[in-house]
Amino acid sequence: DAEFRHDSGYEVHHQKLVFFAEDVGSNKGAIIGLMVGGVV
């Protein structure tokens, strides 16, 4: 997980999420996305 500190003083956590293509369609392989986990 990457962590980024902004000028506001808050930390925003980003998390890589991986899904299998067959769960959301008919292809093989993995789909990788980025989720902003929120402000801590």
């Epitope: 293509a21 067959e22 959301v24 093989k28």
Partner: nanobody, 124 residues
Framework: EVQLVESGGGLVQAGGSLRLSCAVS????????MGWFRQAPGKEREFVGA????????YYADSVKGRFTISRDGAKNTVYLQMNSLKDEDTAVYYC?????????????????WGQGTQVTVSS
């Protein structure tokens, strides 16, 4: 209720191999996405890898890519974790886990079924 039972752990020399098994009962095996996690002493439980429901797709953490292989046998309702070229840092309790279709495969909270864990110790 779905139950997961791991086996195959033990003590192995660095550079050696080990195969873990996870027997699944009490549910429809083909509808459960399976993954492996591990937890070393004093550390958080971390994702190792996962296999799709069909068995056609796999995904691995960078730390084990090229050394570990996950497979599943629908006839035996079993998932396997083949671990090769083991290193000291692979020492951990290994957990088999199951998740509903459509959930992220690499995060703990996706998984609602967990085995009891099996200890793997790599000795140099």
């Amino acid at each position: 209720e779905v139950q997961l039972v791991e086996s195959g752990g033990g003590l192995v020399q660095a550079g050696g191999s080990l195969r873990l098994s996870c027997a699944v009962s009490g549910g429809t095996f083909s509808s459960i996405g399976m993954g492996w996690f591990r937890q070393a002493p004093g550390k958080e439980r971390e994702f190792v890898g996962a296999i799709s429901r069909s068995g056609d797709s796999t995904y691995y953490a960078d730390s084990v890519k090229g050394r570990f292989t996950i497979s599943r046998d629908g006839a035996k309702n079993t998932v396997y974790l083949q671990m090769n070229s083991l290193k000291d840092e692979d020492t951990a309790v290994y957990y088999c886990a199951g998740r509903p279709a459509g959930t992220a495969i690499n995060i703990r909270r996706s998984y609602n079924y967990w085995g009891q864990g099996t200890q793997v110790t790599v000795s140099s």
